[in-house]
């Protein structure tokens, strides 16, 4: 039950996170005109990954797309790439995780397969979240650098007689949406990975399984838990019967070289 809840919650959190990453990527307000300690302009500038906008005092907003690909800064291209990779990975992760959900029955899919899919989607969510956080952070760093550069030469002109208003940009709403969304996707991914561990049956190395030797002497082999990645392994803990070498759900255990006394 706890596993199902963890998996379900991980899925929902990741879904919200990926929706947020998509929203942030599409938003125009990645950077907004800094109004602090600046002349109050009747027009307000803000920029996104795909276009820049100007809102005039009448309320009218005019946006222009970046119709060039080669003329754009490499950093902006990198941010775009990171966000798109994050969205693509997240979307694939969502698709995989839908089939991996314990509450959804698809044919006779093994628990081990669901565990694998859960882990796969979890990893995808983690990478997706990291991509989004990285993309937003790179853009934020770019803004901070440009902000201090434009502050250094806030007013330029001939002999100080003619002044040029330097439009400085600060963090826009999209950055905060991106950070939160990336974090949620990351958390969702971690939850999926945790859920994966509880989904798959443990590989049994004759853990506390008794062997009846000839005569009355019985040899016991206390076994440890085998570390598992979750891929292809049965990581479910088994209830052991005293009488034989088979577990409750009749999974055959094969003896290893250490099993004989």
């Amino acid at each position: 039950m706890a596993v199902t809840a963890c998996q379900g919650l991980g899925f929902v959190v990741s879904l919200i996170g990926i929706a947020g990453i998509i929203a942030a990527t599409c938003m125009d307000q990645w950077s907004t005109q800094d109004l602090y300690n600046n002349p109050v302009t009747a027009v307000f500038n803000y920029q996104g990954l795909w276009r820049s906008c100007v809102r005039e005092s009448s309320g009218f907003t005019e946006c222009r797309g970046y119709f060039t690909l080669l003329g754009l800064p490499a950093m902006l291209q990198a941010v775009r790439a990171l966000m798109i990779v994050g969205i693509v990975l997240g979307a694939i992760g969502l698709l995989v995780s839908i089939f991996a959900l314990k509450c959804i029955r698809i044919g006779s899919m093994e628990d081990s397969a669901k565990a694998n899919m859960t882990l796969t989607s979890g990893i995808m969510f983690i990478v997706s979240g990291l991509c989004a956080i990285a993309g937003v952070s790179v853009f934020a760093n770019m803004l901070v650098t440009n902000f201090w550069m434009s502050t250094a030469n806030m007013y330029t002109g001939m002999g100080g007689m003619v002044q040029t208003v330097q439009t400085r940009y600060t963090f826009g709403a999209a950055l905060f949406v991106g950070w939160v969304a990336g974090g949620l996707t990351l958390i969702g991914g971690v939850m999926m990975c945790i859920a994966c561990r509880g989904l798959a049956p443990e590989e049994t190395n004759y853990k506390a399984v008794s062997y009846h030797a000839s005569g009355h002497s019985v040899a016991y082999k206390p076994g440890g838990f085998k570390a598992s990645t979750g891929f292809g392994s049965n990581t479910k803990n088994k209830k052991i019967y005293d009488g034989g070498a088979r577990t409750e759900d009749e999974v055959q255990s094969y003896p290893s070289k250490h099993d004989y006394v």
Partner: antibody, heavy 120, light 113 residues
């Protein structure tokens, strides 16, 4: 058609207040901000402030803060300008104008002006 | 506040003549966001309210004759009347439409010979 109708001229005593109106016709009142200007006789124009009926946002020229007050009556599509503590310097023609939404980004329609004379 | 300086303050012309008047601002009126200059030109005939001629430095308002042309960028702007007509006798104001408070130039008065 678009029209801004301003109230008639006023003759007022120093220290008093005057409230003039600017009534809008022929367009959606809430879409366009209304700007107010002052023009001393035979001189240039000074921007007093503006009012956006859409969100009730008001901006003032620092010079006129405390002197001028903009109010609105949306039901009658009217913006009011009240000038208080009048002195002879306030004798002028006061214009209201509509700032266009989109193109042109400018004051495209003006009222006929309200002449205010401050005299004892 | 931005100071708008117009020159000359008055201009005496003859019909059909080409007229150029200047407007300088103390700060740039160019918005980096859209590369537009927020400068407006108005015409005020005697006893009338101002009338919009040119917005964003060079865009002609609809209904304004093609003989009126606005040009310039940053801090230096020009209004040109290619062939002056009698009805053009008026005072011409340039206005900063970019930084609050909006400010107007002192005006250029156009007079006929």
């Amino acid at each position: 058609q678009v029209q801004l109708q301003q109230s008639g001229g006023e003759l007022v005593k120093p220290g008093a207040s005057v409230k003039m109106s600017c009534k809008a016709f022929g367009y959606t009142f809430t879409t366009y901000p209304i700007e107010w200007m002052k023009q001393n006789h035979g001189k240039s124009l000074e921007w007093i402030g503006n009012f956006h009926p859409y969100n009730d946002d008001t901006k003032y020229n620092e010079k006129f803060k405390g002197k001028a007050k903009l109010t609105v009556e949306k039901s009658s599509s009217t913006v009011y300008l009240e000038v208080s503590r009048l002195t002879s310097d306030d004798s002028a023609v006061y214009y209201c104008a509509r700032r266009a939404y989109g193109y042109p980004y400018a004051m495209d329609y003006w009222g006929q002006g309200t002449s205010v004379t401050v005299s004892s | 506040d931005i100071v708008m300086t117009q020159s000359p303050s008055s201009l005496t012309v003859t019909a059909g003549e080409k007229v150029t008047m200047s407007c300088k601002s103390s700060q740039s009126l160019l918005n980096s966001g859209n590369q537009k200059n927020y400068l407006t030109w108005y015409q005020q005939r005697p006893g009338q309210p101002p009338k919009l001629l040119i917005y964003r430095a060079s865009s002609r308002e609809s209904g304004v004759p093609v003989r009126f042309t606005g040009s310039g960028s940053g801090t230096d702007f020009t209004l040109t009347i290619s062939s002056v007509q009698a009805e053009d006798l008026a005072v011409y104001y340039c206005q900063n439409d970019y930084i609050y408070p909006y400010t107007f130039g002192g005006g250029t008065k156009l007079e006929m010979n």
